[in-house]
């Protein structure tokens, strides 16, 4: 649960009002715009050295991470999970996110994505788990058994607002980013806009919903004017390198 | 194709219990966040809860919060609703959904909460 | 909460007319976080339009959603025999996810 990923991290520290209750599990009471995003769980230590970063989903470890008990089959001490390293081409996996960038999970294998048959989210995932495949059928190897695409499908990639399971799912300028429960395609920021920094790349922590990150050219700075605010409450806009 | 299906409904008294079950098949469950939708009778739909894709994540509407508890079972590719101190304003028909805007939905359990 | 409030309550239409249903939040969504939805008598809800204007699988191209900010319009441009349901709005901007109280389109 969420609340074990706190219990066991020394990674985060002032969290907010909002997410210090109903356990950890964000209610209706959260009611935010984009121009007020929530941001919970940005506050990190700096971490000197590595140190494996707990985490409770795959969007919350960086994009050639995923998230996962440390090994297989064993929880972990207090069933803790861990972002660990992405699996690269023809490694096994369960699920896409294991896959490092460039490859999603097929037959229980990390492959090379073919983008005109990538499914976006709200695409039936039979685009490449195959259409009329048997889902009941339990593979030899304890993996999922996913049939093999016999034909490419075109689908246009999602727009604003659409369910996805990672960016390339996305139109560009937009990214796959968490929104409560799920994740959808939301714009890119643009200059100006109020960004999220992360002390280490990938810790979305407890966001409740992300913010894509900055575009092209720019990065994600303390706005200028904000030096001397305390540092639970710098703002961070996209800014010309 | 895409299929869920809720049981676990039925007759019970005020401030008795349920457990919905949601039985999902013909996509990668543990890829998609869930969403429990109710219906009273004759009325128009209500948000109930919903959870991330792993479990980790669960959100509620105030009128359940703390009465319900949204699970899943990735491994058995099912999503449940434990529904303790019913009310008879609980009395509706309750819908498992996939994603936050609900691109599939099951056909419905009916709950009646009555003495 | 942002509320949603559906307009009209009831719309009666004969089949190939156009029907247009309208949907206002009491916030601004900011972003197209908006879908609809169709539900015939005794049926689960149907997803017609999701992100504002995007037409879900399936779903035929007489339906179009457009709009943003508070007002949105879903569009059914010439209405067939199995349209007649009602339709509702959702925002998934916020939480809690809220629905609009509906509009009944009925056959004239």
């Known amino acids: 649960t969420l609340n074990s990923v706190l219990i066991n991290s020394n990674a985060i520290k002032n969290l907010p009002p909002p997410l210090g209750g109903a356990g950890g599990q964000p209610g209706s009471a959260v009611s935010v715009a984009p121009g007020v995003l929530y941001e919970g769980g940005n506050k990190y230590q700096t971490l000197d050295n590595y140190q494996p970063y707990p985490c409770a989903e795959d969007e919350e470890c960086g994009s050639d991470e995923y998230c996962s008990s440390p090994s297989r089959g064993a929880a972990g001490v207090g069933g803790v999970q861990i972002c660990l390293a992405c699996r690269k081409r023809r490694k096994r996996c369960m699920r896409h996110a294991m896959c490092c960038p460039g490859n999603y999970c097929k037959n229980g294998i990390c492959m090379p994505s073919d983008h005109s048959h990538f499914p976006r989210g709200e695409i039936e995932e039979s685009i490449i788990e195959n259409l009329g495949n048997d889902h009941n059928a339990a593979a030899g190897d304890g993996y999922p058994r996913r049939t093999t695409l016999t034909s490419k499908i075109y689908h246009t990639k999602g727009q604003e607002g659409s369910v996805c399971l990672r960016s390339s799912d996305c139109a560009a300028g937009l990214c796959c980013a968490r929104h409560f429960w799920s994740k959808i395609c939301k714009p890119v920021l643009k200059e100006g806009q109020v960004c999220t920094k992360h002390k280490r790349k990938g810790s979305h922590g407890l966001e409740i919903f992300q913010r894509c990150y900055c575009g092209e050219g720019l990065a994600c700075r303390i706005q200028k004017d904000h030096h001397q605010a305390s540092n639970s409450s710098r703002l961070h806009t996209c800014q010309r390198h | 194709q895409v299929q869920l299906v809720e049981s676990g409904g039925g007759l019970v008294q005020p401030g008795g219990s349920l457990r919905l079950s949601c039985a999902a098949s013909?996509?990668?469950?543990?890829?998609?966040?869930m969403t429990w939708v109710r219906q009273a009778p004759g009325k128009g739909l209500e948000w109930v809860s919903g959870i991330s894709g792993s479990g980790s994540y669960t959100y509620y509407a105030d009128s359940v919060k703390g009465r319900f508890t949204i699970s899943r079972d990735n491994s058995k590719n099912t999503l449940y609703l434990q529904m303790n101190s019913l009310r008879a304003e609980d009395t509706a028909v309750y819908y498992c959904?996939?994603?936050?805007?609900?691109?599939?939905w099951g056909q419905g359990t009916l709950v009646t909460v009555s003495s | 909460d942002i509320v949603l409030t559906q307009s009209p309550a009831t719309l009666s239409l004969s089949p190939g007319e156009r029907a247009t249903l309208s949907c206002r939040a009491s916030?601004?969504?900011?972003?197209?976080?908006l879908a609809w939805y169709q539900q015939k008598p005794g049926q689960a809800p149907r997803l017609l339009i999701y992100g504002a204007s995007n037409r879900a699988t399936g779903v035929p191209a007489r339906f179009s959603g457009s709009g943003s900010g508070t007002d949105f319009t879903l569009t059914i441009s010439s209405l067939e025999p199995e349209d007649f349901a009602v339709y509702y709005c959702q925002q998934y901007m916020t939480l809690p996810l809220t629905f609009g109280q509906g509009t009944k389109v009925e056959i004239n």
């Open positions: 959904a996939r994603t936050i805007y609900m691109d599939y």
């Open positions: 916030q601004n969504l900011f972003s197209p976080y």
């Open positions: 013909g996509f990668t469950f543990n890829n998609y966040g």
